[in-house]
């Protein structure tokens, strides 16, 4: 299953970044696991997870990390409190869990570049 | 508002053939699996099978395989269900269901009498 | 295929009392993804079935919190805290998670 992430994203000098992920349709998939991977090297590690269902047609990532929203076959991601040592490519992998058959797809990853923003200088 | 019409039920003789119909309005219709599930007189609700509205591929329950064909037309957002070489035992109200994780949307009801 | 066991046939509830009715899988209906596609629906006569539970415990939107169910792997149960008259029909347990997906045979629940 093809799976399609923008390839650079710049993350906000609040240190969030967004964007979507999005999968071939659907079909009938009435339940999809959407992960965000962080990959550094040959490690991946999981950044956040979410299951929505498309009777709610709104994911809500039950995660300190992510917050998102889905509509039919895009999800909107949004990653909170990066720091400059987040910077690095991170990959959506969806998963069509129900009902069967079981499919799996993995973006190629987006690029996130995390700026820390400069202190203020004192005020006299 | 979401619907599932049912029609096409009739008194039919054995070894004759029916198709009953199901349409869907208020809804991507490709977007649900479609579901055939079976009420004999008294009796309790057996699952026929499904058919995936966006790839057309229908799965039947072993008892369903061979005389009953699922199929779609997705220009008029309906749902067939096709019975050949009919039986007595097949006298029963068919019911169709949309399916997500569960069965919120079902048709009415259209009855098969199968009788000489 | 899993068989799906209810039991009682049925049941005969005076208004107000509580009542129970259980759903028995012969293998464990947890899906590979871990999840428990069990399904409670009421049907009443001339009437299609209605949703009142899915995924074992959640109950469908506009299902009074009378109605909740329970259980794991194989045994399942749907509670009727307070039983009222419109709560009459038959009940069935449903299994989504392997193909054949089945209901049970059904619970007769008729009111004093």
């Known amino acids: 299953m093809h799976v399609a992430q923008p390839a650079v994203v710049l993350a906000s000098s609040r240190g969030v970044a967004s964007f979507v992920c999005e999968y071939g349709s659907s079909g009938n998939a009435a339940e999809v696991r959407v992960t965000v991977l962080r990959q550094a090297g040959s490690q991946m590690t999981e950044v956040c997870a979410a299951t929505y269902t498309v009777e709610d047609e709104l994911a809500f990532l039950d995660d300190s990390t992510c917050t998102g929203t889905s509509s039919g076959n895009k999800v909107n991601l949004t990653i909170q409190g990066l720091r400059a040592m987040d910077t690095g490519l991170y990959i959506c992998k969806v998963e069509l869990m129900y009902p069967p058959p079981y499919y799996v797809g993995m973006g190629n990853g987006t690029q996130i570049y995390v700026i820390d923003p400069e202190p203020c200088p004192d005020s006299d | 508002e979401i619907q599932l019409v049912q029609s096409g039920g009739d008194l039919v003789k054995p070894g004759g053939s029916l198709r009953l119909s199901c349409k869907a309005s208020?809804?991507?219709?490709?977007?649900?699996?479609m579901n055939w599930v079976r009420q004999a007189p008294g009796k309790g609700l057996q699952w026929m099978g499904w058919?995936?509205?966006?790839?057309?591929?229908?799965t039947y329950a072993d008892d369903f395989k061979g005389r009953f064909t699922f199929s779609l037309d997705n220009a008029k957002n309906t749902l067939y269900l096709q019975m050949n070489s009919l039986r007595a035992e097949d006298t029963a109200v068919y019911f169709c269901?949309?399916?997500?994780?569960?069965?919120?949307?079902w048709g009415q009801g259209t009855t098969l009498t199968v009788s000489s | 295929d899993v068989l799906m066991t209810q039991t009682p046939l049925s049941l005969s509830v005076s208004p107000g009392e509580p009542a129970s009715i259980s759903c028995r899988s012969s293998?464990?209906?947890?899906?590979?993804?871990?999840?428990?596609?069990l399904e409670w629906y009421l049907q009443k006569p001339g009437q299609s079935p209605k949703l009142l539970i899915y995924?074992?415990?959640n109950r469908f939107s506009g299902v009074p919190d009378r109605f909740s169910g329970s259980g794991s792997g194989t045994d399942f149960t749907l509670r009727i805290s307070r039983v009222e008259a419109d709560d009459a029909g038959v009940y069935y347990c449903?299994?989504?998670?392997?193909?054949?997906?089945?209901f049970g045979g059904g619970t007769k629940l008729e009111l004093k």
């Open positions: 058919i995936n509205t966006y790839t057309g591929e229908p």
């Open positions: 293998q464990s209906i947890v899906y590979s993804n871990g999840n428990t596609y």
């Open positions: 995924k074992v415990s």
């Open positions: 269901a949309r399916r997500s994780i569960y069965y919120p949307y």
């Open positions: 208020g809804y991507t219709f490709t977007n649900y699996g």
């Open positions: 449903f299994q989504g998670s392997h193909v054949p997906w089945t």
